[in-house]
């Protein structure tokens, strides 16, 4: 089959790194300047990538292969092979329109990046709120609050120590 | 422009080597891209191997592992070692860089 399909169509011999030229009748020609082609049988060479502004370059463009982008100190990658940078915000804050804005009281955000979200609700769990959530950190849920009324401990105290040869008082 | 003239090219036993050379002149310097090429008796001219612009070189399925790219910038000349030769490496060699191709030196491999 593979050599079937070469006779048929001469450019599925050019490997990663070429492009079956129309100017030179067909024939396998390396990638030109600045542009690459990852896969064989190509008929166009693309243009490589470049890494500008807000952008950094993380590994460079090759022949076989494009130039992979992420973004400067205080930005984060937004969309698939980091098409987008995005602002960072501090702990605590949320990217808005307007920039970077504080949580609203009972929701956090622990990252550089996404949105604020509403600090858990412990009651649903049946259990109480054991640490306070902050702009930067959610609540921590405790024990049931049943479970913190006087004599309803699911610890069982030890027994009193007792030396041996002695009987209870 | 560039001139580019192959030599090296001569009759060889199967199994045996050869080393082509091509001699650039003209202003290479901003030529990034290097080339050998073959045409073999009524056959297509095809790549062989090459300095992609990144300077790594490459090879054709044909040529991995018996063949060697190499290129002396202080003499201005591109190189193919050609070693374990076979009778289907008869053909026509020519050099190129981007835009220029050389007169070619023939390659003969026969017992």
């Known amino acids: 089959f593979e050599r079937t399909r070469s006779l048929q169509d001469p450019c599925s011999n050019c490997p990663a790194g070429t492009f079956c030229d129309n100017n030179r009748n067909q024939i396998c020609s390396p990638c030109p300047p600045n542009s690459f082609s990852s896969a064989g049988g190509q008929r166009t060479c693309d243009i490589c990538r470049q890494c500008k502004g807000v952008f950094r370059t993380r590994k460079e463009c090759s022949s076989t292969s494009n130039a992979e982008c992420d973004c400067t100190p205080g930005f984060h990658c937004l969309g698939a092979g980091c098409s987008m940078c995005e602002q960072d915000c501090k702990q605590g804050q949320e990217l808005t329109k307007k920039g970077c804005k504080d949580c609203c009281f009972g929701t956090f955000n622990d990252q550089k990046r996404g949105i604020c979200r509403p600090w858990t609700n412990c009651s649903l769990d049946g259990k109480s709120v054991l640490v306070n959530g902050t702009k930067e950190r959610d609540v921590v849920c405790g024990p049931s609050p049943a479970d913190l009324s006087p004599g309803a401990s699911s610890v069982t105290p030890p027994a009193p120590a007792r030396e041996p040869g002695h009987s209870p008082q | 422009a560039v001139q580019l003239v192959e030599s090296g090219g001569g009759l060889v036993q199967p199994g045996g080597s050869l080393r082509l050379s091509c001699a650039a002149s003209?202003?290479?310097?901003?030529?990034?891209?290097w080339s050998w090429y073959r045409q073999a008796p009524g056959k297509q001219r095809e790549l062989v191997a090459w300095f992609a612009w990144d300077n790594i070189a490459h090879y054709t399925d044909s040529a991995k592992g018996r063949f060697a790219i190499s290129r002396d910038n202080t003499k201005k000349t591109l190189y193919l070692q050609m070693n374990s030769l076979k009778l289907e490496d008869t053909a026509v060699y020519y050099c190129?860089?981007?835009?220029?191709w050389g007169q070619g030196t023939q390659v003969t491999v026969s017992s």
């Open positions: 003209g202003n290479i310097f901003s030529i990034r891209v």
């Open positions: 190129n860089s981007e835009d220029s």
